[in-house]
């Protein structure tokens, strides 16, 4: 069947998901549409211990995460909510800002060298985390 | 021998509609992104379409956008390309070619020899 | 979209010359490059990806270096099945790869 049973070559597995860590950089929705091409989409961040796994693996290297305001308020690539979700933003941030004289705010999400979250400018070529989750079918436990 | 082998091609009038197939074999198909590059005569190479190796997301060029249609068959091993409202300038050799991705990089590793579509009057 | 210029288009060339192929991207790409080989007739080859990442069964006189705008294709000690057209291309822009416009080599 198409069920995702376990992960891909090169992926890791952490809590009935998949991950891939890259280690060269895009843009924010270059990295975005490689993870959607991987049937994947860019890391969403839903707990302190899914925070502390991929921090554990990228080290302190800016790296894009699937959280963004391009279209207004923040959200995450694959429709968890914002809102009532986990947050690890470094203090003052996000803080749109307008000063790095490249065009425009920051409405990009992406862990920082010490974990915490900034926004950032789109186009930055930074590290990226894909997630995808193995399939709920493949999760139930065998008929005895 | 691992193999793409393209299909469907031939003449057809502006505004017509064709199907182009690349049936696979040999490999992992369903495991690999794949993609539709044409070539028109004498001239580059352009990029079309591509399609994730599970068929969940869909990309195009925005010379295409709109009229052409990229979809694969995993359990037949087979991509398509369905061309509507065609035009002149997509008179090409049109080669399915799966994606190569490594480290985060990104190429194309297998082609098929390719299939000629004109667009004439 | 990311433009890709290639020189020079053409060049005649011997048997056993050393030959280099120059790729120019519109933007930095990092090192996001491949070159193809393509053959009258025939569907185009990978060579090298990753800018200086030799593809498995490729023969060890083709190499590519560069990174940021600029790249090349070395061919060290032309053989006669190297005669054909070669193509850059960026993978930065994922999906939107775009190519080059080919560079011609043939026999002097």
């Known amino acids: 069947g198409s069920e995702r049973t376990c992960c891909p070559v090169n992926w890791v597995e952490h809590e009935r998901s998949c991950y891939w860590f890259s280690r060269s950089g895009k843009a924010w929705a270059d990295a975005d549409n490689y993870c959607r091409l991987e049937d994947a989409h860019l890391v969403v961040v839903t707990s302190w211990e899914e925070q502390k796994f991929v921090q554990h693996h990228i080290g302190p290297v800016n790296t894009w995460m699937g959280l963004h305001d391009q279209n207004g308020p923040w959200k995450w690539v694959d429709g968890t909510d914002y809102e009532t979700g986990f947050k690890n933003w470094r203090p003052e941030q996000p803080d749109d800002w307008y000063g790095h004289g490249l065009g425009g705010g920051e409405d990009c999400a992406h862990f920082t060298d010490d974990g915490r979250w900034n926004d950032d400018v789109c186009q930055r070529p930074y590290r990226w985390v894909c997630e995808t989750e193995l399939d709920k079918a493949s999760q139930e436990p065998p008929l005895l | 021998e691992v193999q793409l082998l393209e299909s469907g091609g031939g003449l057809v009038q502006p505004g017509g509609s064709l199907r182009l197939s690349c049936a696979a074999s040999e490999f992992t198909f369903s495991s690999y992104a794949m993609s539709w590059v044409r070539q028109a005569p004498g001239t580059g190479l352009e990029w079309v379409s591509i399609i994730s190796g599970r068929g969940g997301n869909t990309f195009y060029a925005d010379s295409v956008k709109g009229r052409f249609t990229i979809s694969r068959d995993n359990s037949k091993n087979t991509l398509y390309l369905q061309m509507n409202s065609l035009r002149a300038e997509d008179t090409a050799v049109y080669y399915c070619?799966?994606?190569?991705?490594?480290?985060?990089?990104?190429?194309?590793?297998?082609w098929g020899q390719g299939t000629m579509v004109t667009v004439s009057s | 979209d990311i433009q890709m210029t290639q020189s020079p288009s053409s060049l005649s060339a011997s048997v056993g010359d050393r030959v280099t192929i120059t790729c120019r991207a519109s933007?930095?790409?990092?090192?996001?490059l491949n070159w193809y080989q393509q053959k009258p007739g025939k569907a185009p080859t990978l060579l090298i990806y990753a800018a200086s990442s030799l593809q498995s069964g490729v023969p060890s006189r083709f190499s590519g270096s560069g990174s940021g705008t600029d790249f090349t294709l070395t061919i060290n000690s032309l053989q006669p099945e190297d005669f054909a057209t070669y193509f850059c291309q960026q993978s930065y822009r994922t999906p939107f790869f775009t190519f080059g416009p080919g560079t011609k080599v043939d026999i002097k």
């Open positions: 070619a799966s994606r190569l991705a490594v480290a985060g990089s990104e190429a194309f590793d297998i």
């Open positions: 933007q930095s790409i990092s090192s996001y």
